[in-house]
């Protein structure tokens, strides 16, 4: 693994993709989505220590300033670098529609 | 302002663009950047309460799951939605070069 992918806090503690099982009720979608009724939501969770999966130069700056001014500048944050599409079958006024959402499931993660 | 831009926590508490004044020493650039010697770093800082500047459906899901499972799923995070370029004059082996960085200064912010 690249240096930027080795977690100094221990396995699984740093920014990475997690899967959270959620019902449509959990998501607040129960009244408009027909299928699936249970979703495997992939999201980015974990700490962003120095040099770990830094997305860009902004993330580097943010980490440097966070170390200097921790009360003012937060550490970089673990967010999706890209997304996987998700297909929902949903209720419409005229029946049932097939809808793809491109920004719903995280595909991989980085620190910004 | 759209509903998603009104901060329920009070003025200036939610995710927005901040300017942090930083020297090259602060940024760890003193040994390779000649100019500017001081940088106005724009970055995204602040809380992401429900429905505030949600970037996409992933952010909506994350907030819903955070409310249900706060110990497992963190709240959405304030990150750059886009960047402003910044020009640095830097030292090279052969002299001095002008380099533009596209991912250095946050231009606007959203919650992901």
């Amino acid at each position: 693994a690249r240096n930027g992918d080795r977690c100094p806090l221990g396995p699984g503690r740093c920014c990475r993709l997690h899967t959270v099982h959620a019902s449509l009720e959990d998501l607040g979608w129960a009244d408009w989505v027909l299928s699936p009724r249970e979703v495997q939501v992939t999201m980015c969770i974990g700490a962003c220590p120095s040099q770990f999966r830094e997305a860009n130069m902004h993330a580097q700056i943010k980490m440097n300033l966070h170390r200097l001014k921790p009360d003012t500048v937060p550490a970089p944050c673990c967010v999706p670098a890209s997304y996987n599409p998700m297909v929902l079958i949903q209720k419409t006024d005229t029946g049932v529609s097939l809808q793809t959402y491109d920004d719903l499931l995280a595909k991989d993660c980085h620190c910004v | 302002a759209r509903n998603g831009d009104r901060c329920p926590l009070g003025p200036g508490r939610c995710c927005r663009l901040h300017t942090v004044h930083a020297s090259l020493e602060d940024l760890g650039w003193a040994d390779w950047v000649l100019s500017p010697r001081e940088v106005q770093v724009t970055m995204c800082i602040g809380a992401c309460p429900s429905q505030f500047r949600e970037a996409n459906m992933h952010a909506q899901i994350k907030m819903n799951l955070h409310r249900l499972k706060p110990d497992t799923v963190p709240a959405p995070c304030c990150v750059p939605a886009s960047y402003n370029p910044m020009v640095l004059i830097q030292k090279t082996d052969t002299g001095v070069s002008l380099q533009t960085y596209d991912d250095l200064l946050a231009k606007d912010c959203h919650c992901v």
Epitope: L34, S35, P36, R37, P85, M86, V87, I89, L105 | -
Partner: antibody, heavy 118, light 107 residues
Framework: QVQLVQSGAEVKKPGASVKVSCKAS????????IFWVRQAPGQGLEWMGW????????HYAQKLQGRVTMTTDTSTSTAYMELRSLRSDDTAVYYC???????????WGQGTLVTVSS | EIVMTQSPATLSVSPGERATLSCRAS??????LAWYQQKPGQAPRLLIY???TRATGIPARFSGSGSGTEFTLTISSLQSEDFAVYYC?????????FGGGTKVEIK
């Protein structure tokens, strides 16, 4: 693991009806919908329609509208596809397919051959 | 409805060679495209979804690319078990539609 087990082969006369069953296991039946797909001998795949076990909502291919009915029985985790007024060109292998959140599906039944012949 | 056209209808390839299969949609389907492999007497097997994401357990020699109306399935080095019929499927709109298939046969 997810399994879809379909009923056995059928031979029907033109004008008759056929009802193919698809018993699901390995997941919560009402969490996902079921697609039906058919394949005539030596031909490609044709999508027939979809049903959600959760609410019974359906969406059928236009060319089969009026002849096809998809139903589910949540007590037995079984989906059914009935096709009426059978013609010789309905001779095909009929597959049930569980839907997924990604669009494509790895979960297919083994297929049921329906032969329509006088 | 969206018409999916696959080419060629038959592809003759030697084991170990690369195979490139094409699928064209009559209108944009974004990345809402899947590829299936089918062998005689068997149900189709999902290879790729989202135009380029390999399904669980699918070997790395299978790769998908494209978006909009033009898509490609590439098998980098054909193994004996890869000789089969391949179908593309769009799930961007009802009705879901399949291509006519490409038969990959031994040269």
């Amino acid at each position: 693991q997810v399994q879809l087990v379909q009923s056995g082969a059928e031979v029907k006369k033109p004008g008759a009806s056929v009802k193919v069953s698809c018993k699901a296991s390995g997941y919560t039946f009402t969490d996902y919908g079921i697609f039906w797909v058919r394949q005539a001998p030596g031909q490609g795949l044709e999508w027939m329609g979809w049903i959600t076990a959760y609410s019974g909502d359906t969406h059928y291919a236009q060319k089969l509208q009026g002849r096809v009915t998809m139903t589910t029985d949540t007590s037995t985790s079984t989906a059914y596809m009935e096709l009426r007024s059978l013609r010789s060109d309905d001779t095909a292998v009929y597959y049930c397919v569980r839907d997924t959140q990604y669009g494509g599906s790895p979960y297919w039944g083994q297929g049921t051959l329906v032969t329509v012949s006088s | 409805e969206i018409v999916m056209t696959q080419s060629p209808a038959t592809l003759s390839v030697s084991p170990g060679e690369r195979a490139t299969l094409s699928c064209r949609a009559s209108q944009s389907v974004s990345s809402n495209l899947a590829w299936y492999q089918q062998k005689p007497g068997q149900a189709p097997r999902l290879l790729i979804y989202g135009a380029s994401t390999r399904a669980t357990g699918i070997p790395a020699r299978f790769s998908g690319s494209g978006s909009g109306t033009e898509f490609t399935l590439t098998i980098s080095s054909l193994q004996s078990e890869d000789f089969a019929v391949y179908y593309c499927q769009q799930y961007n709109n009802w009705p879901i539609t399949f291509g006519g298939g490409t038969k990959v046969e031994i040269k």
